[in-house]
């Protein structure tokens, strides 16, 4: 039952990654552990896209639980053949994986845009603006520019770290869902089991 085991493994990985995405996104609302910036709406616009909470988080739990459920042994058959039901389930998991691809893709895109634009911060002229927006992401390579942001404390480090984490987590989720698309298609077409004998039975 290698296709099912693979799907289950991917499912468990996605649950962990989704939870990490949700945590990373929540932390973006509290720069330096303070709530005042969220209440004053002094947060990057891309924080409000909920990419980690929705895209890489909640939306990822749906395919994750579908994948985990694929290895259950009491799967109903079709036309008297148990494995046919499992093959249908494997093919339907491809749809769930596509939802996962959409969610993780959204997470990756928003995180990349958040990194490119940089944080909303108080600059040395007392203006709340996207201080690094005009640098087209070059600020990421020149940490000496980060001191342009005078508030919140360490906001550039905070934003860069968390959006990078969301980018990485979303990327891993995307790859895992892509693997499950391939796994689901192979499992559905070639049969649920690895042995040629069992495939023939179906």
């Amino acid at each position: 039952m290698c296709y099912g085991k693979c799907a289950r493994c991917i499912g468990h990985s996605l649950v962990g990654l989704a939870l990490l995405c949700i945590i990373a996104n929540i932390l973006l609302y509290f720069p330096n552990g303070e709530t005042k910036y969220a209440s004053e709406n002094h947060l990057s616009r891309f924080v409000w896209f909920f990419s980690g909470i929705v895209g890489g988080g909640l939306l990822m739990l749906l395919p994750a639980f579908v994948f985990i459920g694929l290895e259950q042994d009491d799967c109903c058959g079709c036309c008297g053949h148990e494995n046919c039901g499992k093959r249908c389930a494997m093919l339907s998991s491809v749809l769930a994986a596509l939802i996962g691809i959409a969610g993780s893709g959204y997470c990756v895109i928003v995180a990349a845009l958040g990194l490119a634009e940089g944080p909303l911060c108080l600059d040395s002229f007392g203006q709340w603006n996207y201080t690094f927006a005009s640098t087209e992401g070059q600020y990421l390579l020149d940490t000496s520019t980060w001191s342009q942001c005078t508030e919140p404390k360490h906001i550039v480090e905070w934003n860069v770290s968390l959006f990078s984490i969301l980018l990485a987590l979303g990327g891993i989720e995307f790859i895992l869902c892509l693997i499950q698309v391939i796994n689901g298609v192979l499992g559905g077409i070639c049969g649920f089991c690895c042995s040629r004998q069992q495939q023939y039975d179906c």
């Epitope: 330096n32 108080l122 002229f125 000496s144 404390k153």
Partner: antibody, heavy 113, light 107 residues
Framework: EVQLQQSGPELVKPGASVKMSCKAS????????MHWVKQKPGQGLEWIGY????????NYNEKFKGKATLTSDRSSNTAYMELSSLTSEDSAVYYC??????WGRGTLVTVSA | DIQMTQSPASLSASVGETVTITCRAS??????LAWFQQKQGKSPQLLVY???TLAEGVPSRFSGGGSGTQFSLKINSLQPADFGSYYC?????????FGSGTKLEIK
Amino acid sequence: EVQLQQSGPELVKPGASVKMSCKASGYTFSSYVMHWVKQKPGQGLEWIGYINPYSDVTNYNEKFKGKATLTSDRSSNTAYMELSSLTSEDSAVYYCARNYFDWGRGTLVTVSA
Amino acid sequence: DIQMTQSPASLSASVGETVTITCRASKNVYSYLAWFQQKQGKSPQLLVYNAKTLAEGVPSRFSGGGSGTQFSLKINSLQPADFGSYYCQHHYNIPFTFGSGTKLEIK
């Protein structure tokens, strides 16, 4: 009306230290960065550093690290700059500026034996 | 550190004239540039920041332009109050260095 009241002129001996103040009024002190700028007589402007009174974040011009120390006291709405190990090169007018928009009148420091 | 080169070092002009002061950065500073005016014995005053944003209370005859490494401050229809020294300053990274200044004198 925003006002930055700087402390009076200082005549100090080489090797000594001096601490000047910049008392702010007319705005929320902790909401704005305070910059410090040096100007030698008849010369141009030199940025020393800034302090954010809310977060106490400071950033210095590398040239003034170890020379200048920026602090602030939110209870009295006052920013301070202490200059140590003074030499004749430190003789100048020192300005405090709220986000560059509003400037103090400057504190003249004269280092002389 | 980023070097800021101002030109000319000094300039004589008459009331009503239009003058342009230029500032060159040794490295791309995007639009992170400010202009200051300082009159003899007085504190500097912010005129322009972010290359072209006029500070509050600054007359519209002042205008800033440029980006990257080349910047300019244009003063239309010079007034007696406009004479003094002008400084550019980048605020791209630490240290926020000033130009050496341009002294604008009455002809």
